[in-house]
């Protein structure tokens, strides 16, 4: 089992992830692990020499880069917020701010926009991943209502008047709650103080 550097006539290396072909010497050399970069290139007699990325820089993959990438903050102007910091082994992790969705994607999200409001009587369909797409508004299911224009309001169950010792005055709709009233109408003024048996 040859250890880098070793000769390669067919320009391929056994471990594509951790080795690379160096055409000048026609050899396979070690890549540098995540969090490091090439500080000295390999030769026929010496393998790649790696060094740790300096503060505020990173390399995410096994590489033969002679520099590390500069850490960049998430851009709040583009509606992004940070969920995890940059380390020597990974770039800053960003996501759309609450109430926004990803509107432009180039390997990662580059621009977020405000989620559309869902009108009364509807709610946003729940997605597997928050911030991945704009709202798709769906009607409230039977027995539920939602009475605002909002990107995030959820349909709520109609009030059950009987649970509060009341009776229904007007039924609930998709846009409004049930209206309840007291089952005992107030006594007429002339009968107040009189007890009906």
């Amino acid at each position: 089992q040859a250890v880098p550097p070793y000769a390669s006539e067919n320009q391929t290396c056994r471990d594509q992830e951790k080795e690379y072909y160096e055409p000048q010497h026609r050899i396979c050399c070690s890549r540098c692990p995540p969090g490091t970069y090439v500080s000295a290139k390999c030769s026929r007699i010496r393998d790649t020499v790696c060094a740790t990325c300096a503060e505020n820089s990173y390399n995410e993959h096994w590489n033969y880069l002679t520099i590390c990438q500069l850490c960049r903050p998430c851009d709040p102007v583009m509606g992004l917020e940070e969920i995890a910091p940059c380390t020597s082994k990974r770039k800053t992790q960003c996501r759309c701010q609450p109430g926004m969705f990803c509107a432009a994607w180039a390997l990662e999200c580059t621009h977020c926009e405000l989620l559309s409001d869902c009108p009364p009587g509807t709610e946003a369909e729940l997605k597997d991943e928050v911030g991945k797409g704009n709202n798709h508004c769906v009607p409230c299911k039977a027995g539920h209502f939602q009475n605002t224009s909002s990107p995030s309001a959820r349909c709520q169950p109609h009030t059950r008047c009987e649970n509060q010792g009341l009776v229904e005055a007007a039924p609930g709709t998709a846009q409004s709650d049930t209206t309840c009233k007291n089952p005992l109408e107030p006594l007429p003024p002339e009968m107040s103080g009189t007890m009906l048996m």
């Epitope: 969090g35 940070e82 380390t87």
Partner: antibody
């Protein structure tokens, strides 16, 4: 060498606000995140939030959202942490710290006492 | 939020002893864990980052290990200046969280 020098101890009344400063030197102020961490007596260290002075954007721990404001003045390389609606539980040592795979650099700490 | 559960909360040891402190994360944090030493009235000092990398100037008797959810700080031979409180911290995701500390006292 990197230095973070914080303002002096403060005694505050409940309901009031406190503003602690952290003056940075020995590095490019605008390219590193500055965080605020507090340590109440007998309690765990608690991360409050950070500011990136390059774009003066701050992000906060949900626990303190609405009560904490972190700002930075690029001209003086100084970061500030203001905590409002103070209560007795906010009595703590407040630290600023510069991050990179942990916190390699810390200020000396500012003791804030909240007492009526 | 990710909880960092540190144990023991305190321990008594003698100079020359081998001391081990553990920290358990409530979810996977990769190797994004740091260890600190703190003495009374002072700010914490970074000892270890990326779970096992000794910070510059930290004596070789301090070592860190672990990944995922289980992490360990080991002091191979305790010195008089090592009596202090030690904290772990995850910096994998916000909000950053700390263990509540292990106080190393003289037996």
């Amino acid at each position: 060498q990197v230095q973070l020098v914080q303002s002096g101890a403060e005694v505050k009344k409940p309901g009031s606000s406190v503003k602690v400063s952290c003056k940075a030197s020995g590095y490019t102020f605008t390219t590193y995140y500055l965080h605020w961490v507090r340590q109440a007596p007998g309690q765990c260290l608690e991360w409050m939030g950070w500011i990136y002075p390059g774009n003066v954007h701050a992000q906060y721990n949900e626990k303190f959202k609405g009560r904490v404001t972190i700002t930075a003045d690029k001209s003086t390389s100084t970061a500030y942490m203001e905590l409002s609606s103070l209560r007795s539980e906010d009595t703590a040592v407040y630290y600023c710290a510069r991050s990179w795979e942990g916190f390699p650099y810390w200020g000396q700490g500012t003791t804030v006492t909240v007492s009526s | 939020d990710i909880q960092m559960t540190q144990s023991p909360s305190s321990l008594s040891a003698s100079v020359g002893d081998r001391v081990t402190i553990t920290c358990k994360a409530s979810q996977n944090v990769g190797i994004n864990v740091a260890w600190y030493q703190q003495k009374p009235g002072k700010a914490p000092k970074l000892l270890i980052s990326s779970a096992s990398y000794r910070y510059s100037g930290v004596p070789s008797r301090f070592s860190g290990s672990g990944s995922g959810t289980d992490f360990t700080l080991t002091i191979s031979s305790l010195q008089p200046e090592d009596f202090a409180t030690y904290f772990c911290q995850q910096y994998d995701t916000y909000p950053f969280t700390f263990g509540c500390g292990t106080k190393v006292e003289i037996k």
